[in-house]
Structure formats: structure tokens, C-alpha cells
């Protein structure tokens, strides 16, 4: 039960995390205009990975896409790549983890296969989360560097009365969404990996003794009732032999009125 809960919770947390990574990647507010030196501006600038926007106080917002690929900073390209890799890995991880969920039965899939799939999806979520955190952190570092560079030459035209105030950018909402989402995906991945340990069959084989009653060919199977109910959580790690040496899962794989899908 605890394993199923851990796996399910890991899946849900990762799902929220990946949705957050997608949202952060699409958001325009990766960097927003720093208003410390000019809190009374009637024009507000903010930038995303894909376009930059200007919001006028009058309510009009104008966004322009970065239609060049070669003209963009290498760091921005790297951040884009990291976020996309994170999304792709996360999406694949989600797909794999759906089939790995213990509460979902697909054909005659063994616990060992589900355990492997859970581990695979967990690793994918961890890498996805790390990609998102790395991407956001690289962008944040870029912002901090540019912020202090522009502060060093805040006023580019101090000659006489005329002042040209350079626009400085600070952390936008997307960065925080990205950090949180990356963290959630990472946590979800770790939970999936923990759940995998509980799903993996133990090495020890416990052999059941068959008692053949005269005139009847009925095999006594320890935990057999639980196997038939579809709730065999206590016996899931025991291999029960029944003449043909089938595992409990194989016995269960034939649907009965007691099977819950």
C-alpha cells in the first residue's frame, strides 16, 4: 500500500512539476524591468525565452518574437535547450510512469517490469528536474551579471542636462515557477525511485508445500485467498509454486470477477 501511495504521489508531483516547467518555458516574464531607479515609468519591459514584451500603462502590450537564431546569445540558446530537454524527458517519463503505476494493470506485466519502468521514469524525472533547475539558474546568473554591468554604467550620457537611463532587468516570475517546478519534478523522480525498490521482487524464493488430498487434485497455496482477491500485497514478493511453477502474478493475470483494474 505504501509503495503504491509513494508511486502515485511521485507521479502526481512529477506531473505538476512538468506542467510547471512547460508553463515556465512558455512564460514571457523570465526577466522584468527593474523599477528601483525609475519607479514611475509609464512603460514596462519584460522578456521571455522566445519573445520580448512592452506593456504601456495605458494597457497596451506589444510582444516581438526573437526571429533570429544565430543572433541570440549562446546562453539563451543553452537555456532554451535545457528547458526543452527537461520537457521532453519529463513527457517521456510521464508516459513510462503511467504504465508503471501499480494501480493500472496492463496484460500480464510482471512486478519486475513495473519496477524497472518506475525506476526509468524516476531517473527521467530527476534529470528533467535538474535540466529545468539548471536552465533557470543559468538564466538567473546571466541576469545578475548583466544587472551589475548595467549598474556600473547606469547613466551613459551624463554630459550636461541630458541623461540616458539604461534599462536594467531583474528576476521575472518564470524563474521562480521554473525553480519550483524543477524541484517538484526532482522530488517526484526521487519518490518514483523509492517506490521502485518496494516494487522489485526479492531474490529469495519461498517454496510452498503441496499437500495432495486423496481423491482431490487441489493444491494448497499459502496466501492463495489474497491472490484471488486481487489485493495480494502481502504475498507480492513471494513466488508460489503450483505444479507448473507459475508466479502469483501469472496466476492473477487471468481476469476473474475479483480482479480490480
Amino acid at each position: 500500500m505504501a509503495v503504491t501511495a509513494c508511486q502515485g504521489l511521485g507521479f502526481v508531483v512529477s506531473l505538476i512539476g512538468i506542467a510547471g516547467i512547460i508553463a515556465a518555458t512558455c512564460m514571457d516574464q523570465w526577466s522584468t524591468q527593474d523599477l528601483y531607479n525609475n519607479p514611475v515609468t509609464a512603460v514596462f519591459n519584460y522578456q521571455g525565452l522566445w519573445r520580448s514584451c512592452v506593456r504601456e500603462s495605458s494597457g497596451f502590450t506589444e510582444c516581438r518574437g526573437y526571429f533570429t537564431l544565430l543572433g541570440l546569445p549562446a546562453m539563451l540558446q543553452a537555456v532554451r535547450a535545457l528547458m526543452i530537454v527537461g520537457i521532453v524527458l519529463g513527457a517521456i517519463g510521464l508516459l513510462v510512469s503511467i504504465f508503471a503505476l501499480k494501480c493500472i494493470r496492463i496484460g500480464s506485466m510482471e512486478d519486475s517490469a513495473k519496477a524497472n519502468m518506475t525506476l526509468t521514469s524516476g531517473i527521467m524525472f530527476i534529470v528533467s528536474g535538474l535540466c529545468a533547475i539548471a536552465g533557470v539558474s543559468v538564466f538567473a546568473n546571466m541576469l545578475v551579471t548583466n544587472f551589475w554591468m548595467s549598474t556600473a554604467n547606469m547613466y551613459t550620457g551624463m554630459g550636461g542636462m541630458v541623461q540616458t537611463v539604461q534599462t536594467r532587468y531583474t528576476f521575472g516570475a518564470a524563474l521562480f515557477v521554473g525553480w519550483v517546478a524543477g524541484g517538484l519534478t526532482l522530488i517526484g523522480g526521487v519518490m518514483m525511485c523509492i517506490a521502485c525498490r518496494g516494487l522489485a521482487p526479492e531474490e529469495t524464493n519461498y517454496k510452498a508445500v503441496s499437500y495432495h488430498a486423496s481423491g482431490h487434485s487441489v493444491a494448497y497455496k499459502p496466501g492463495g485467498f489474497k491472490a484471488s482477491t486481487g489485493f495480494g500485497s502481502n504475498t507480492k514478493n513471494k513466488k508460489i509454486y503450483d505444479g507448473g511453477a507459475r508466479t502469483e502474478d501469472e496466476v492473477q493475470s487471468y481476469p476473474s470477477k475479483h480482479d480490480y483494474v
Partner: antibody, heavy 117, light 113 residues
């Protein structure tokens, strides 16, 4: 089409509060801002302040302690209150809608307010 | 506050001639985000409210004749009337729309010579 019309008393006594109303039609009060601008007789334009679509306000630094701009969306009205008026506040008061580039694209006809005892 | 300085205070130009009005701001009105200058030009005829002519320093408002054009960037701006018509007699104002307070220039009175 967009229309703005200022209304209020034409005469205000010194030290009293000047109250004007701008009734608008043809645009959404929650989407666009409205500025108040005044023009003393024979002089240039002076921006007083603005209330934006989201309800936030900005005022001229020289008037900030005396001015309040508000709006009543249900009545499609904007109001200007200027306290402790003096003869220097005698002017034609205009309300104007803010558009692209924060420019004032539609103006009311204006109302003359005289401050005199 | 940004100070807007217009020159000349008054200007007399013959009909059909070019009229040029200058406006200088104490700070740059160029927004780096969209590379647009937040400067607006208005025309005010006697007894009337001002009328928007040009915003973003060079974008003509719809319905404004194409003889009116705006130019300039940063702190120096110009309104040009390529061929003066009798109906262009008015006072012209520039306005900073970049930073609060949204200050106006002192105005330039345009007359016919």
C-alpha cells in the same frame, strides 16, 4: 464612438475642494486609463494625473498632496478632486482617454473652473 | 521630473512652406524594450481641446494629414509640417509619455507669415 464630457461647478472659493466629473462612453473603463489635464487662461497644458484601467493612479509631483482621481465603473464616470484651491488653480480642466503609446487620443471639451471669493 | 523644452515659442511661416518645431527632453524617451520613443505631439486650435497628431515620436494618428511628420530619437525631436495650410494655425505641444509625471512642453504658436 468615444466621448468624454467634463462637468462640475464653474466657480470655487479659495481653500475649498474643486470636484469635477468626467462621464465617458464608447470604451471600457476597466481597459483604458483617463488623464486629467488643465490649462490656465492663455497658458500651456499641465498634466494633473491619471487613473488606469486597473484602478491604479499616478499624479503630478507638484499636486500629489492635493489631488485624488477615482472612478465609478457602474456610472461610467471619472472624478477629480483638488483640495485647498487657490487662484493659481483657475483653468480649463480636460479629461482625456489614454491610448497607444500612452498618448491622449480622445479629449473632452473642457470645463472652465474659476477660483475666486 | 522630465523637463520638456520646445523651440521656438512662436513661428511664422508662409502658406505652402515647411514649418519645423523642436522639442528637447531632459532625459531620453527611448524605450530599449521596443526601440520606441515615447514622445507625443498635439495640436490645439483656439477654443478647442488638444488633438493628438503623432505618438511614438513618428507614428501618425489615424485621420491626421500626411503633411504632418515626426522624427527624432532619445532627447531631440522634431515636428514637421511639409506644406503649411491655413487650418494648421494652432499651438503645438510635445509631451513626455515615458515617465511620470507625463509632462508637456511649453507649446509653440504657429502663425501664417
Amino acid at each position: 464612438q468615444v466621448q468624454l464630457q467634463e462637468s462640475g461647478p464653474g466657480l470655487v472659493k479659495p481653500s475649498e475642494t474643486l470636484s469635477l466629473t468626467c462621464t465617458v462612453s464608447g470604451f471600457s473603463l476597466t481597459s483604458y486609463g483617463v488623464s486629467w489635464v488643465r490649462q490656465p487662461p492663455g497658458k500651456g497644458l499641465e498634466w494633473i494625473g491619471v487613473i488606469w484601467g486597473d484602478g491604479s493612479t499616478n499624479y503630478h509631483s507638484t499636486l500629489i498632496s492635493r489631488v485624488t482621481i477615482s472612478k465609478d465603473t457602474s456610472k461610467s464616470q471619472f472624478s477629480l478632486k483638488l483640495s485647498s484651491v487657490t487662484a493659481a488653480d483657475t483653468a480649463v480642466y480636460y479629461c482625456a482617454k489614454a491610448g497607444r503609446g500612452n498618448a491622449l487620443d480622445y479629449w473632452g471639451q473642457g470645463t472652465l473652473v474659476t477660483v475666486s471669493s | 521630473d522630465i523637463v520638456m523644452t520646445q523651440s521656438p515659442d512662436s513661428l511664422a511661416v508662409s502658406l505652402g512652406e515647411r514649418a519645423t518645431i523642436n522639442c528637447k527632453s531632459s532625459q531620453s524617451l527611448l524605450n530599449s524594450g521596443n526601440q520606441k520613443n515615447y514622445l507625443t505631439w498635439y495640436q490645439q486650435k483656439p477654443g478647442q481641446p488638444p488633438k493628438l497628431l503623432i505618438y511614438w515620436a513618428s507614428t501618425r494618428e489615424s485621420g491626421v494629414p500626411d503633411r504632418f511628420s515626426g522624427s527624432g530619437s532619445g532627447t531631440d525631436f522634431t515636428l514637421t509640417i511639409s506644406s503649411l495650410q491655413a487650418e494648421d494655425v494652432a499651438v503645438y505641444y510635445c509631451q513626455n509619455d515615458y515617465s511620470f509625471p507625463l509632462t508637456f512642453g511649453g507649446g509653440t504658436k504657429l502663425e501664417i507669415k
